[in-house]
């Protein structure tokens, strides 16, 4: 014959453990059931009475199977510099991202609490690590031999192109001009591009240096961290 | 060097104000998020506001909303905060804060202090 | 009363390990922010000593490490020094504050 199915509350056999979608409250000393994604627990369980759920208030959500006193609170609405990816449900938190030509300043477990704009890079000096989801663009001087000449977060120093006869020679922040006999080869035939998009933000004026410690893997974002830039100066 | 500076603090009255700067040098001024934190005597740290980089956003502690302003100029590489209807109990030093939100408060002034007191 | 919840001291002799605990709630630690640690020393600013969890910012030993599990936190310190007599405090971000926390601080004596 089949077990005869306990309607909850019920105590449970001495060893064993509660069914899915129920708890063991231990004040009572029964299995109770849990309450449903988007409600809370209202009236906990009792010997005599089961849990009395009720739906989550405004602005408020439960995900999961539970037996919380409160729902939990939706984050803050999402700044301009964000766009909302999930809505804030009685079921579900709000997701906020940055937008494109932006980086998560502030990462959550999910989505992101404060949004900066990917640095530039400003003439005579180069992207030396391009922007994440989670990091920022880090610049770097342009070394001997080599140029750029944009405001970018996406550009890269370029090698001066070689002349037969110098008219002008190249520094960090232009390329070399050769006489009207062109170029023997041009190592620059057009801007090297990074895959990120342009951004709005001023330029540090000298590089970020690495992390001196390895990427955290505390977040569901996909890059590692770049550390906070240290010895810029200001424009 | 990374050096933030603050000044500004002294004896004040309590309803009375008062105007903190923080001269920052060393960075990139305006790519950072900055922040206020006070620390009355003999206790703990305490968040006052926090400005955007480009100053379009301010947030504040509720001990002090409507009575304290954060601003910064980007031009001059300053922050600065406006204390008003000062009470005993914002007696604290002041320390002007870069935040780099993933990475910590990273760089701290040396702090001014604030006396509110008849 | 501080959002995050710290011991008001903790202490050890030279060379033992001491840990100290930053505990949390769904709208800080436990909403995934990251906690960072401070170090102040007497008469001193703050300064940065663990962030995002567990990392070190250049300069910090090894002897300090940091950890992070669903609403709390903690700090190690391994190898006692005198020079490490200070108070530590852990901070976040708080969605409900709308704004970083700091723990109420703990003041770590070295026997």
């Known amino acids: 014959l089949p077990a005869q199915v306990a309607f909850t509350p019920y105590a449970p056999e001495p060893g064993s453990t509660c069914r899915l979608r129920e708890y063991y409250d231990q004040t009572a000393q029964m299995c109770c059931s849990k309450c449903s994604p988007g409600q809370h627990a209202k009236v906990f369980c009792t010997k005599t009475s089961d849990t009395v759920c009720d739906s989550c208030e405004d602005s408020t959500y439960t995900q999961l199977w539970n037996w919380v006193p409160e729902c939990l609170s939706c984050g803050s609405r999402c700044s301009s510099d964000q766009v909302e990816t999930q809505a804030c449900t009685r079921e579900q938190n709000r997701i906020c991202t940055c937008r494109p030509g932006w980086y998560c300043a502030l990462s959550k477990q999910e989505g992101c609490r404060l949004c900066a704009p990917l640095r530039k890079c400003r003439p005579g000096f180069g992207v030396a690590r391009p922007g994440t989801e989670t990091s920022d663009v880090v610049c770097k001087p342009c070394a001997p031999g080599t140029f750029s000449n944009t405001t970018s977060s996406t550009d890269i120093c370029r090698p001066h192109q070689i002349c037969n006869v110098v008219a002008i020679p190249g520094n960090a922040s232009m390329d070399a001009v050769c006489t009207s006999t062109s170029p023997t080869r041009s190592m620059a035939p057009g801007a090297v591009h990074l895959p990120q998009p342009v951004s709005t933000r001023s330029q540090h004026t000298q590089p970020t240096p690495e992390p001196s410690t390895a990427p955290s893997t505390s977040f569901l974002l996909p890059m590692g961290p770049s550390p906070p830039a240290e010895g810029s100066t200001g424009d | 060097e990374v050096q933030l500076l603050e000044s500004g603090g002294g004896l004040v009255q309590p309803g009375g104000s008062l105007r903190l700067s923080c001269a920052a040098s060393g960075f990139t001024f305006s790519d950072y998020y900055m922040s206020w934190i006070r620390q009355a005597p003999g206790k703990g740290l305490e968040w006052v506001a926090l400005i955007w980089y480009d100053g379009g956003n301010e947030y504040y502690a509720d001990s002090v909303k409507g009575r304290f302003t954060i601003s910064r100029d980007n031009s001059k590489n300053t922050l600065y905060l406006q204390m008003n209807s000062l009470r005993a109990e914002d007696t604290a030093v002041y320390y002007c804060v870069r935040e780099t939100g993933n990475y910590g408060m990273d760089v701290w002034g040396q702090g001014t202090l604030v006396t509110v007191s008849s | 009363q501080s959002v995050l919840t710290q011991p008001p001291s903790a202490s050890g002799t030279p060379g033992q390990r001491v840990t100290i605990s930053c505990t949390g709630s769904s709208s800080n630690i436990g909403a995934g922010y990251d906690v960072h640690w401070y170090q102040q020393l007497p008469g001193t600013a703050p300064k940065l000593l663990i962030y995002?969890?567990?990392q070190r910012p250049s300069g910090v030993p090894d002897r300090f490490s940091g950890s992070k599990s669903g609403t709390s936190a903690s700090l190690a310190i391994s190898g006692l020094r005198s020079e490490d007599e200070a108070d530590y405090y852990c901070a976040t971000w708080d969605d409900r504050v709308n704004g970083p926390v700091f723990g109420g601080g703990t003041k770590l004596t070295v026997l």
């Open positions: 995002r969890n567990n």
